[in-house]
C-alpha cells in the first residue's frame, strides 16, 4: 500500500530514453498523443512532473510482515493529465484524471545504472514503459538480465 | 532484524590485496543496491563503491577505479570488496550499507555494518 | 563531483539549545540530501533523507530542510544523546558525496 497520499517530493525533469531522443507531449483532438524523437539543437524539452510516494511492500521473509519501501512515482507533463498503463493494449496513454489517482497511474522506480531510471507498471509487475516503433508502449521483462535493455531505460534531466 | 556483518580486514603491506565480504540477513538482498563506504581514522566519511540490485552496474570514485573491485551473489546474499594495488591512503574502516528502496539509489543509507579496519602500512 | 560544504565543523552547545547545521552544494540537485549522525567508534545512523523526510525511528526534534544547494539539519532542543558528529550526503549524481562533517560538543 501506499504510504500517505502525499508524495514524499516532487521532481520536475524532462524525460529522454537511453539514446538520447526526447518524450514530448502533443495536444491533438482534445486528447494528448506521446512521441519519441529527436529534437533540434535548441529545441525546448517538454517536462513531466514526477511525484514520488513510498510503498510499502509485504515480505515473507521478516517478523513484522513488512520487508521494505519502494518508490512509486506518477508522471504528469501537464495539469491534470497522467500517464497511464493501459495493459490490454499494452499501451502508455495520457489520461485526465482526479485525485487519488488509480493504480494504472502508478510505476515502482527502479535505477538500473547511476544515471538511468525505468519504470515498472505498479498493476503489472515485470512490465515497464519501454520504446517500441517511435512511441512509449509497456513492454514485459522476463528476466532480470533483460533489465538493462535499452528501450526500458530512461534518463531525467533537469535542463 | 537487518543485519549487515562486515569481514576481511586486516593489515597489508602497500601493493597487496584483500578482499572484504558483507554478510547480509533479514532483508530480501537481491532487491536493494549496496554500497561501501569508508571511513580513515578520525576523518570523513567517503563512498567507495556501489552495485546495482541485479549485479549488473558497478560505480565508484576515481580513488579507486582500476583498483577496486565491487561485487555480489545474490544466492548467498553477500556482497564483496576486492581490493587491489593497495595504498596507504586506503586505511580506513570499511562499512557495508544497504539502500532505503527496493531497486533504487534514493533515500541514503538507513542500515551500516560494524564496519571492518583495513589498515596499509610496510 | 558536487562539493558538500557542511558548516560549521566544530560547535559548542548546552542540553536544550536549538542547533543549526548547514550543508552547502557547490551544484543544485535535487533533494536526494541525507543526514547522519555518528558516535565515536559507531556506525553512522541515517536521520533524515529526502532533504526532509525523518527516518522510522529518529526523535522528531531531528529536522531537515532545504533545496537546490542549500540544506539545513535543525536539532530542536538538544539532548544528552545527541553529542555526536553529524554528516550530509547527496545521492543525486554520481560520485556520491558526503560533507566533511559537524561535531556537537557539550559546552
Known amino acids: 500500500s501506499i504510504t500517505g497520499i502525499s508524495p514524499i517530493t516532487e521532481y520536475l525533469a524532462s524525460l529522454s530514453t537511453y539514446n538520447d531522443q526526447s518524450i514530448t507531449f502533443a495536444l491533438e483532438d482534445e486528447s494528448y498523443e506521446i512521441y519519441v524523437e529527436d529534437l533540434k539543437k535548441d529545441e525546448k524539452k517538454d517536462k513531466v512532473l514526477l511525484s514520488y510516494y513510498e510503498s510499502q511492500h509485504p515480505s515473507n521473509e521478516s517478523g513484522d510482515g513488512v520487508d521494505g519501501k519502494m518508490l512509486m512515482v506518477t508522471l504528469s507533463p501537464t495539469k491534470d493529465f497522467w500517464l497511464h498503463a493501459n495493459n490490454k493494449e499494452h499501451s502508455v496513454e495520457l489520461h485526465k484524471c482526479e485525485k487519488p489517482l488509480p493504480d494504472q497511474a502508478f510505476f515502482v522506480l527502479h535505477n538500473m545504472h547511476s544515471n538511468c531510471v525505468s519504470f515498472e507498471c505498479k498493476t503489472d509487475p515485470g512490465v515497464f514503459i519501454g520504446v517500441k516503433d517511435n512511441h512509449l508502449a509497456l513492454i514485459k521483462v522476463d528476466s532480470s538480465e533483460n533489465l538493462c535493455t535499452e528501450n526500458i531505460l530512461f534518463k531525467l534531466s533537469e535542463t | 532484524e537487518v543485519q549487515l556483518v562486515e569481514s576481511g580486514g586486516g593489515l597489508v603491506q602497500p601493493g597487496g590485496s584483500l578482499r572484504l565480504s558483507c554478510a547480509a540477513s533479514?532483508?530480501?538482498?537481491?532487491?536493494?543496491?549496496m554500497t561501501w563506504v569508508r571511513q580513515a581514522p578520525g576523518k570523513g566519511l567517503e563512498w567507495v563503491a556501489s552495485?546495482?540490485?541485479?549485479?549488473?552496474?558497478?560505480y565508484y570514485p576515481d580513488s579507486v577505479k582500476g583498483r577496486f573491485t565491487i561485487s555480489r551473489d545474490n544466492a548467498k546474499n553477500s556482497l564483496y570488496l576486492q581490493m587491489n594495488s593497495l595504498r596507504a591512503e586506503d586505511t580506513a574502516v570499511y562499512y557495508c550499507?544497504?539502500?532505503?528502496?527496493?531497486?533504487?539509489?534514493?533515500?541514503?543509507?538507513?542500515?551500516w555494518g560494524q564496519g571492518t579496519l583495513v589498515t596499509v602500512s610496510s | 563531483d558536487i562539493q558538500m560544504t557542511q558548516s560549521p565543523s566544530s560547535l559548542s552547545a548546552s542540553v536544550g539549545d536549538r542547533v543549526t547545521i548547514t550543508c552547502l552544494a557547490s551544484?543544485?540537485?535535487?533533494?536526494?540530501l541525507a543526514w547522519y549522525q555518528q558516535k565515536p567508534g559507531k556506525s553512522p545512523k541515517l536521520l533524515i533523507y529526502a532533504a526532509s523526510r525523518l527516518q522510522d525511528g529518529v526523535p522528531s526534534r531531528f529536522s531537515g530542510s532545504g533545496s537546490g544547494t542549500d540544506f539545513t539539519l535543525t536539532i530542536s532542543s538538544l539532548q544528552p544523546e545527541d553529542f555526536a558528529t553529524y554528516f550530509c550526503?547527496?545521492?543525486?549524481?554520481?560520485?556520491?558525496?558526503f560533507g566533511g562533517g559537524t561535531k556537537v560538543e557539550i559546552k
Open positions: 550499507t544497504r539502500a532505503n528502496y527496493y531497486y533504487n539509489t534514493y533515500g541514503g543509507f538507513p542500515y
Open positions: 550526503q547527496q545521492g543525486s549524481k554520481y560520485p556520491l558525496t
Open positions: 552495485i546495482t540490485y541485479t549485479g549488473g552496474g558497478t
Open positions: 533479514g532483508f530480501t538482498f537481491n532487491n536493494y543496491w
Open positions: 551544484e543544485g540537485f535535487s533533494n536526494d
